[in-house]
């Protein structure tokens, strides 16, 4: 179930979800690209990192991101019996000590330097989508996803009951 909230009684579910272990179940080094095959790149500018969405030249090397996968319980506010089961959460780190963060106030995605344990803003619910794609939902803001807006990553509110084009929140992971 793509389980996107957009429903009031769901809004606490991810806030209350707990990472079952402090160490990831597995890690994966991959390049991140959009549904339309634009690359997600990271550039150090004035001692801070900027995130870009761009077309790479033919032989240009793609930036890699370390994805750390965590198991997380998804408590069901609807049933009270935990029937929603466990879900997978992920953190994304393009370089040592830096992680993607959700800035819900600014609706932006930022790279922050921080130490473990990571804040909730660095965790995203991983959605397994068709067409070999995934989506990243904010742990701190259910129904809000990492998406592409004006050649940048942004936070995009999604409602499962709306008939919207969703390609801007779909991402591909590749080892190459």
């Amino acid at each position: 179930a793509f389980g996107i909230s957009g429903v009031q009684k769901y809004t606490r579910a991810l806030h209350d979800s707990s990472i079952t272990g402090i160490s990831p179940i597995t890690e994966y080094l991959a390049s991140l690209s959009t549904y339309n095959d634009q690359s997600i790149t990271f550039a150090l500018e004035d001692e801070s990192y900027e995130i870009y969405v761009e077309d790479l030249k033919k032989d240009e090397k793609k930036d890699k991101v370390l994805l750390s996968y965590y198991e997380s319980q998804h408590p069901s506010n609807e049933s009270g019996d935990g029937v929603d089961g466990k879900m997978l959460m992920v953190t994304l780190s393009p370089t040592k000590d830096f992680w993607l963060h959700a800035n819900n106030k600014e609706h932006s995605v930022e790279l922050h330097k921080c130490e473990k344990p990571l804040p909730d803003q660095a965790f995203f619910v991983l959605h397994n989508m068709h067409s070999n794609c995934v989506s990243f939902e904010c742990k701190t803001d259910p129904g809000v996803f990492i998406g592409v807006k004006d050649n940048h990553l942004a936070l995009i509110k999604v409602d499962s009951s709306e008939n919207l084009c969703t390609e801007n929140i779909l991402f591909k992971l590749s080892e190459t």
Epitope: A1, G3, T26, Y28, L88, H130, S160, S161, E162
Partner: antibody
């Protein structure tokens, strides 16, 4: 309580049609991908069909054995998913389970009790 | 289609002993750095129940005696100490590609 209840099964002649229904309760139905899985008598499990969300344009996927004969659909206002089965064959005889995928689409974690479809003359 | 093959077809194990079921995929079920391999338990007259997802993660409320391992094409479900209530048929399933396919099942009985 989270529940899926199938109905519409029964005896049908080869070449006939049947529509199965699955009524969902206890969760926000419109948020979940739904599946049909069948099990022939004394046999193993066979995945049949899947439908996504309005948000995903209700995209559908089918097993090759039923493609073109079976159609999965849903009515979010009625919390119901359907399986329209046409041109039925003896080999379609099975218990048909309605099933819900979990939050994030990693596995099926809610199943109905199943409804028996018998195709025989 | 990815073909899933389980072995053995049936298994008789004494109470308290270890039971091991194998599952082999006709091609790798790995994607995104994970194995898209689930294990289900089905008791007579009941629908299946999830035990393990992404090869080694336990489903909610699943007893610790059930564990999964493997990657690529070869996977194992282990019941560390068989209990009477574990008598059932066990299925592996790949969810990497459509059509999602199940193994033929392994029947576990008490010796």
């Amino acid at each position: 309580e989270v529940q899926l209840v199938e109905s519409g099964g029964g005896l049908v002649q080869p070449g006939g049609s049947l529509r199965l229904s699955c009524a969902a309760s206890g969760f926000t139905f419109s948020n979940y991908w739904m599946n049909w899985v069948r099990q022939a008598p004394g046999k193993g499990l066979e995945w049949m069909a899947e439908i996504t969300l309005k948000f995903n344009s209700y995209s559908t996927h089918y097993a090759e054995s039923v493609k073109g004969r079976f159609t999965i659909s849903r009515d979010d206002s009625k919390n119901t998913v359907y399986l329209q089965m046409n041109s039925l064959r003896a080999e379609d005889t099975a218990v048909y389970y309605c099933a819900r995928r979990n939050y994030g689409n990693w596995y099926i974690n809610v199943w109905g009790q199943g409804t028996l479809v018998t195709v025989s003359s | 289609d990815i073909v899933m093959t389980q072995s053995p077809d049936s298994l008789a194990v004494s109470l308290g002993e270890r039971a091991t079921i194998n599952c082999r995929a006709s091609e790798s079920v790995d994607k995104f750095g994970m194995s898209f391999l689930n294990w289900y338990q089905q008791k007579p007259g009941q629908p299946p129940k999830l035990l393990i997802f992404v090869a080694s993660s336990q489903g909610s409320g699943v007893p610790d005696r059930f564990s999964g391992s493997g990657s690529g094409t070869d996977f194992t479900l282990t019941i560390s100490s068989l209990q009477a209530e574990d008598v059932a048929v066990y299925y592996c399933q790949q969810s990497k590609d459509i059509p999602y396919t199940f193994g033929q099942g392994t029947k576990v009985e008490i010796k």
